[in-house]
């Protein structure tokens, strides 16, 4: 029969950051190809990555339709090679993925400090709002649009001349902090979803940005424009 030398996929793993979501699996195919299906608990199965020899499938387009839904995927193994000799009457072997709820499980991408500006003893630090592939009315939503008040940012800041860190938190993408006049500071931010109780509640820290040496300097680290 046609499926006797096909093996079921295994180690199905979701890899998701800022809702960009890839399903990965093993093994690397030998004489077989894969087709992936994805479904919500109540929905129909939809085929993706049809007859692929890859061991990953980008399912972002499907999960962004409703990031609060819970999704299940499965990977089918079909024989490759000469169809006439691999034609089968059996159902192909398949393996189910773990369930995946994007809103709860997507990892937070590394944030970026967009700009900071010092005025006297105050510094305004702005975190860049990352775009996601989640849409509403044909418009792409930012991370803040999707998570709203569930998303906070933590700012770590310290004098360039010392290692003692201070922290600040914001429900927006901006911090206004007090600094000592004449001192230079370094900054790093982290995205956090406090309601999560899992390892993915925090992002990695942003790259460190430091103030220049001249008193009262304001520094722009650059704006990123996203085109979709």
């Amino acid at each position: 029969s046609g499926t006797t030398n096909t093996v079921a996929a295994y180690n199905l793993t979701w890899k998701s950051t800022n809702f960009k979501t890839i399903l990965e699996w093993e093994p690397k195919p030998i004489n077989q190809v894969y087709t992936v299906q994805i479904s919500t608990k109540s929905g129909d199965w939809k085929s993706k990555c049809f007859y692929t020899a890859d061991t990953e499938c980008d399912l972002t387009d499907e999960i962004v339709k409703d990031v609060k839904q819970t999704y299940l995927a499965r990977v089918f193994s079909y024989p490759a090679g000469h169809v006439e000799s691999t034609g089968s009457t059996e159902e192909p072997p398949y393996e189910n993925s773990p369930e995946f709820t994007p809103y709860l499980e997507t990892n937070l991408g590394q944030p970026t400090i967009q700009s900071f500006e010092q005025v006297g003893t105050k510094v305004n630090v702005t975190v860049q709002d990352e775009w996601t592939l989640v849409r509403r009315n044909d418009t792409f939503l930012s991370l803040r649009d999707v998570f709203g008040k569930d998303l906070i940012y933590t700012l770590y800041y310290w004098k360039s001349s010392s290692s003692g860190k201070k922290t600040a938190k914001t429900n927006t993408n901006e911090f206004l902090i007090d600094v000592d006049k004449g001192e230079n500071y370094c900054f790093s931010v982290q995205a956090v979803i406090p309601s999560r109780r899992t390892a993915n509640r925090k992002s990695t820290d942003s790259p460190v940005e430091c103030m220049g040496h001249e008193k009262g300097e304001s520094r722009e680290t650059g704006h990123h424009h996203h085109h979709h």
Epitope: Y51, T52, F76, H82
Partner: antibody
Amino acid sequence: QVQLVESGGGVVQPGRSLRLSCAASGFTFHSRGMHWVRQAPGKGLEWVAVITYDGINKYYADSVEGRFTISRDNSKNTLYLQMNSLRAEDTAVYYCARDGVYYGVYDYWGQGTLVTVSS
Amino acid sequence: DIVMTQSPDSLAVSLGERATINCKSSQSVLFSSNNKNYLAWYQQKPGQPPKLLIYWASTRESGVPDRFSGSGSGTDFTLTISSLQAEDVAVYYCQQFHSYPLTFGGGTKVEIK
């Protein structure tokens, strides 16, 4: 010998539905993936949809996704294409074709059935 | 999606002469693990369905005359009719079966000069 015979074409108004059938004979139908390919009058070939031999997996061109449904009845050796919300641009000859030496290589085609979407 | 571009759109060749049709894919259709090009050529005569000529870019389908040959790799492919016969008047299509959605070239019409 292998035969694929399409039926169900005709003239239909925009927004209406039509179901095409493809009767297969001369080969083990349940062991082959099957496809629908269309050709607008005077134009080139456009792949429409595929269904795996087992009927479990289906895939569609973006232009028909959500409107067309491919299915098969292996007990009747028949392939179907349910076409809903038809548009003028769906006017074409619809061919069924079977997987040949590899998935997506068509060694046999039906003669086609003409679908005309017009008010 | 992989876009297939054929050239020329039409071709007039004298009987017995060589006809050459080109097909270019927007990304490679070569699968490195088996070193095969996932490309096919079809012939379509007026009022008929297409007929498979070549698959894997260069393998002739059973029963296809040996005057038809395919070559190329990666993104650039050629169908050659070494000595055009009257019955070869048709439209020729290339098609990639590397990844879904499957896509065809726009076709090349071959006529007798």
